[in-house]
């Protein structure tokens, strides 16, 4: 009975025309929503003009029904056993799960005055950034939209700038009529041990910004895992949001639409500075702002975001140092809302609820040059946004799983 | 202290052109808007339109595209508006206003104007 | 184009009286800098305009404190506390938050 079933599975888990696996795969039948919560800064001027603690306040949730669109350009390689594929981005807004619209105003950070000033340490070329700053009269925080904000609008300053740069700003700018990838993943035809495993991502093993094997893609995209997944293994997964593979943890047993799950959480050691977790080493990559690679629960991915100052953390700076939050005033950070959890089927190895947080973070820094920026004293780590992307099995799907994986094992 | 002084009144036939010219002193000319603004015999006040002497950037209001144009001369800190195809609608004072943003510590919006240029159109 | 509607048209007051000044815009003056460039001028009869209240409620240097300016967003408000001769003339709000910019019709301050 058992090997029966364990041939069913690793039949059934292949990625390929014909199987449960790939239909799922190609368009996934879960419905995933991101929750936007935007953090409001209540006291521009106060922090431009004396350096104070920013204070912020989150708005949200502004709710985007995301990853509806098949996957694409999917190309079965018999070779190697692998499939290669684009995976489509698409957001539309959901306004019945959301506390406003889309032309809510919001004042955050001015992310071209806080980019550039990074992106162009040069004291001359700064006195040219700061008299067109001052023509656009653009400053150290903005009023915008939602829309704008996290889809993209022309920025004033930007638009002076006399060569040509890219004038178009915002957090996932650009998004919709965009693909990540090219993924090519394991099909499981020769071993199923290493089916959704990614083999390269955009043509290559490696990532090319972090050195040694940070720079690694380990694992799958987290969307499922090889079969017959044990408590005690250490799940592998590449996120591009984060430019990076990361890990998981057994946590605990869950019991989803009577399907019995495992839950895998992001363990806050993944999060840890060299100093507590010597296996991050190589994700500190500067050692100023770090504090000499002391500070954790933040991760500069400037070197994947065309040099731009971002910063990746956990929601309200979950797991990091307290040096990261004490220029910051607003923040409650609550494991239960803000940790990342994935819920897996350990014989289909296939996630069935997940729940991703993470927070997008600016870097801006004090300018003797840019005025907008020379009162400040110190290094602020701006809390922009943080996303909760999640998705649950549908109540048929959930049925169907029962009736045709679980029922029969049990 | 800033002063901004205009070119004096004048008289000037119908379809006929003016230039008008506006002085700075007192700050630094090349990095702060120069505005202008029309004022009819007892009405209010019209922005024509501004610009950025350091580069000459310009912008104008719809309504005067093509009746004014801004230029400005850095050497001598001076700014003009020509006024074209002139005729009795264009008799006004215009006025020069400068418009300093300084990375939002000095930002006061037309803060010193000049005392005006009388432009009268008559044949 | 961004209308400032201005109200009164004409405001009689007696020196010492408080006066009140409203001016209305079409669309909102928040600038996406986090400002609000609403300005006050006086203007008297053959002068230049003369700035009073700059970005909605700060006074100009030199500028006596019984003048005050309130609002945001669309509505704006100048007060003076007690009238004095040298207050009267016309008084005109103004916005630079955008292009092209735009006055209200102005209010006549005058004697009752």
């Known amino acids: 009975g058992d090997m029966l079933i364990q041939k069913t599975i690793k039949k059934e888990v292949v990625l390929e025309e014909g199987t449960i696996a790939f239909k799922n795969w190609v368009k996934t039948g879960t419905e995933i929503y991101r929750q936007f919560w935007i953090f409001d800064v209540q006291n521009p001027q106060e922090v431009m003009m004396n350096s104070s603690n920013i204070q912020v306040k989150q708005r949200g949730p502004y709710t985007y029904r995301v990853r509806f669109l098949a996957k694409e350009n999917i190309t079965q390689d018999p070779k190697d056993n692998t499939v290669s594929f684009l995976q489509p981005n698409g957001a539309i807004f959901e306004p019945s799960l959301s506390v406003g619209t889309e032309a809510d105003n919001f004042t955050v950070l001015n992310l071209a005055v806080a980019a550039a000033s990074h992106i162009y340490p040069n004291p001359f070329v700064q006195v040219v950034l700061n008299s067109l700053i001052n023509k656009s009269k653009s400053s150290m925080f903005q009023v915008r939209t939602l829309r704008e904000l996290l889809w993209g609008y022309t920025d004033p300053f930007l638009s002076l700038v006399p060569y040509p740069v890219s004038t178009r700003v915002g957090m996932f700018y650009p998004y919709n009529n965009t693909a990540d990838g090219v993924y090519k993943v394991f099909n499981g035809k020769d071993s199923i041990s290493k089916v959704a495993i990614i083999d390269t991502y955009k043509g290559k093993r490696n990532l090319s910004y972090w050195e040694s094997y940070c720079d690694m893609i380990n694992g799958t995209d987290a969307a499922s895992f090889p079969p017959f997944v044990e408590k005690s293994q250490v799940l592998q997964f590449f996120s591009s949001d984060i430019c990076r593979s990361i890990y998981a943890v057994f946590e605990s047993d869950v019991n989803l639409k009577g399907i019995p799950v495992y839950r895998f959480v992001l363990p806050s050691k993944a999060f840890a500075s060299p100093v507590q977790n010597p296996d991050n080493h190589c994700f500190c990559t500067e050692k100023i702002i770090s504090k000499n690679c002391t500070s954790y629960g933040v991760l500069d991915i400037s070197k994947c975001k065309e040099g731009k100052p971002v910063y990746i953390s956990l929601p309200h700076f979950l797991y990091a140092s307290p040096d990261v939050s004490e220029t910051i005033d607003g923040l409650n950070p609550n494991e239960e809302e803000h940790r990342t959890y994935l819920d897996i089927e350990p014989i289909t190895g296939f996630t069935l609820q997940f729940a991703k947080r993470l927070q997008v973070n600016l870097l801006v820094k004090p300018s003797n040059k840019i005025q907008v920026l020379k009162r400040l004293k110190r290094n602020y780590i701006v809390p922009i946004l943080w996303l909760n992307e999640t998705g649950t099995i549908g109540d048929e799907k959930a049925k169907m799983f029962r009736s045709q994986v679980t029922g029969k094992i049990n | 202290q800033v002063q901004l002084q205009q070119s004096g009144p004048e008289l000037v036939k119908p379809g006929a052109s003016v230039k008008i010219s506006c002085k700075a002193s007192?700050?630094?000319?090349?990095?702060?808007?120069m505005n202008w603004v029309k004022q009819r015999p007892g009405q209010g006040l019209e922005w024509i339109g501004r610009i950025y002497p350091g580069d000459g950037d310009t912008n104008y209001n719809g309504k005067f595209k093509g009746k004014a144009t801004l230029t400005a001369d850095t050497s001598s800190s001076t700014a003009y508006m020509q006024l074209s195809s002139l005729t009795s609608v264009d008799s006004a004072v215009y006025f020069c206003?400068?418009?300093?943003?300084?990375?939002?510590?000095?930002?006061?919006?037309?803060?010193?104007w000049g005392q005006g240029t009388s432009v009268t159109v008559s044949s | 184009d961004v209308v400032m509607t201005q109200t009164p048209l004409s405001l009689p007051v007696s020196l010492g009286d408080q006066a009140s000044i409203s001016c209305r815009s079409s669309q909102s003056l928040l600038h996406t800098n986090v400002n609000t460039y609403l300005h006050w001028y006086l203007q008297k009869p053959g002068q230049s305009p003369k700035l009073l209240i700059y970005?909605?409620?700060n006074r100009f240097s030199g500028v006596p404190d019984r003048f005050s300016g309130s609002g945001s967003g669309t509505d704006f408000t100048l007060k003076i506390s007690r009238v004095e001769a040298e207050d009267l003339g016309v008084y005109f709000c103004?916005?630079?938050?955008?292009?092209?910019?735009?006055f209200g019709g102005g209010t006549k301050l005058e004697i009752k």
């Open positions: 970005k909605v409620s």
């Open positions: 206003a400068r418009e300093v943003y300084y990375g939002g510590y000095e930002d006061y919006g037309m803060d010193y």
């Open positions: 103004s916005q630079s938050t955008h292009v092209p910019y735009t």
């Open positions: 007192g700050y630094t000319f090349s990095t702060s808007w």
